[in-house]
């Protein structure tokens, strides 16, 4: 039950995270005009990964796409790439995790397959979240660098007086959406990886065979071969039945009350 909850929660958290990454990538407000020097501007500028916008005194907003590919800064291209990779990995991760969900039955899929799929989707979510966080952080770093460069330029010139004040940009809403969304996707991925441990069949126990030595009543049970899953072993509450061993966390081959949600 705990495994199902962890897996389900991981899936939902990742889903929200990836939706946030997509939203952040599409948003226009990655950088917004810094209003510190001109809080009463009638013309407000903001920029996204794909276009820049200007809101005018009339309330009308005009947006123009970046129709050049080669003319764009390499950093912007890198951020775009990171966000797209994050979205693609996240989307594939979501697809894989749907089939890996313990509460969904697909034919006679084995638990080991579900465990592997859960782990795969978990890793994909982690990488997706890291891509988003990296992309947003690179953009934020670019903004900070440009901000201080334009601040330095602002106060240079003829006696510190500059008629054309360079527009400075600060963090836009999309950066915060991206950071939060990336973090959620990362957390969701970690939860999926944790759930994977509980899903994995951890031990293959053979039918107990007793060898009776004359004059002794010592039973020898060869059960020391563990199926290696790579996630360590969990030896708690192992019950040995005639039909072989099964951990309590393992799903049964016939429907239980937790199989349909």
């Amino acid at each position: 039950m705990a495994v199902t909850a962890c897996q389900g929660l991981g899936f939902v958290v990742s889903l929200i995270g990836i939706a946030g990454i997509i939203a952040a990538t599409c948003m226009d407000q990655w950088s917004t005009q810094d209003l510190y020097n001109n809080p009463v501007t009638a013309v407000f500028n903001y920029q996204g990964l794909w276009r820049s916008c200007v809101r005018e005194s009339s309330g009308f907003t005009e947006c123009r796409g970046y129709f050049t590919l080669l003319g764009l800064p390499a950093m912007l291209q890198a951020v775009r790439a990171l966000m797209i990779v994050g979205i693609v990995l996240g989307a594939i991760g979501l697809l894989v995790s749907i089939f890996a969900l313990k509460c969904i039955r697909i034919g006679s899929m084995e638990d080991s397959a579900k465990a592997n799929m859960t782990l795969t989707s978990g890793i994909m979510f982690i990488v997706s979240g890291l891509c988003a966080i990296a992309g947003v952080s690179v953009f934020a770093n670019m903004l900070v660098t440009n901000f201080w460069m334009s601040t330095a330029n602002m106060y240079t010139g003829m006696g510190g007086m500059v008629q054309t004040v360079q527009t400075r940009y600060t963090f836009g809403a999309a950066l915060f959406v991206g950071w939060v969304a990336g973090g959620l996707t990362l957390i969701g991925g970690v939860m999926m990886c944790i759930a994977c441990r509980g899903l994995a069949p951890e031990e293959t126990n053979y039918k107990a065979v007793s060898y009776h030595a004359s004059g002794h009543s010592v039973a020898y049970k060869p059960g020391g071969f563990k199926a290696s899953t790579g996630f360590g072993s969990n030896t708690k509450n192992k019950k040995i039945y005639d039909g072989g061993a099964r951990t309590e966390d393992e799903v049964q081959s016939y429907p239980s009350k937790h199989d349909y949600v």
Epitope: N38, A42, V43, N45, E56, G59, R64
Partner: antibody, heavy 115, light 113 residues
Framework: QVQLVQSGAEVKKPGASVKVSCKAS????????MHWVRQAPGQRLEWMGY????????SYSQKFQGRVTITRDTSASTAYMELSSLRSEDTAVYYC????????WGQGTTVTVSS | DIQMTQSPSSLSASVGDRVTMTCKSS????????????LTWYQQKPGKAPKLLIY???TRESGVPSRFSGSGSGTDFTLTISSLQPEDFATYYC?????????FGGGTKLEIK
């Protein structure tokens, strides 16, 4: 076509208040900010403030801060400008202005402040 | 506040003349975000509301005759009427559309010589 129709001329006593209305037609009222500009006889045009009809947000010129209130009724596609504590120098023609590049002006409302 | 200064304050000319009037702003009206100068020119006739002629310093409003042209960037702007027509005699105002409060120039009154 896009049109702004303002209320009629007003004569007020000093210290009183005046409320001028501006009814918009021919476009979506919430698409553009509504600005108010006045012109005293023989003087230059003077911006008073604006309202964002979408959310009711306003911005006023420091000169009129505390005396001017701009409101709107989206259901009636109408904006209102109220100027309080009137003095003789407030005698002017008041215009509402909207659309992109502030291209459309109302016909103007003459407000005369006289004792 | 941005101060807008127009010159001359009045101008006498004849039909068919080419006239030029200037407008200076105390701060740049250039917006680097879209590479536009936020200066607007209006024409006003007595007893009428102002009429938009030019926005973004040089873009003619639709329906405005081609004899009207605007130029300039930053803080210095010019309105030119290439060949004066009888209906062009009016007062012309420039306006800062870049920063609040939106401010207007004192106007240039164009009179018949």
């Amino acid at each position: 076509q896009v049109q702004l129709v303002q209320s009629g001329a007003e004569v007020k006593k000093p210290g009183a208040s005046v409320k001028v209305s501006c009814k918009a037609s021919g476009y979506t009222f919430t698409d553009y900010n509504m600005h108010w500009v006045r012109q005293a006889p023989g003087q230059r045009l003077e911006w008073m403030g604006y309202i964002n009809p979408n959310n009711g947000g306003t911005s006023y010129s420091q000169k009129f801060q505390g005396r001017v209130t701009i409101t709107r009724d989206t259901s009636a596609s109408t904006a209102y400008m109220e100027l309080s504590s009137l003095r003789s120098e407030d005698t002017a023609v008041y215009y509402c202005v909207t659309t992109r590049y502030l291209a459309v002006w109302g016909q103007g409302t003459t407000v005369t402040v006289s004792s | 506040d941005i101060q807008m200064t127009q010159s001359p304050s009045s101008l006498s000319a004849s039909v068919g003349d080419r006239v030029t009037m200037t407008c200076k702003s105390s701060q740049s009206l250039f917006n680097s975000g879209n590479q536009k100068n936020y200066l607007t020119w209006y024409q006003q006739k007595p007893g009428k509301a102002p009429k938009l002629l030019i926005y973004w310093a040089s873009t003619r409003e639709s329906g405005v005759p081609s004899r009207f042209s605007g130029s300039g960037s930053g803080t210095d702007f010019t309105l030119t009427i290439s060949s004066l027509q009888p209906e062009d005699f009016a007062t012309y105002y420039c306006q800062n559309d870049y920063s609040y409060p939106l401010t207007f120039g004192g106007g240039t009154k164009l009179e018949i010589k």
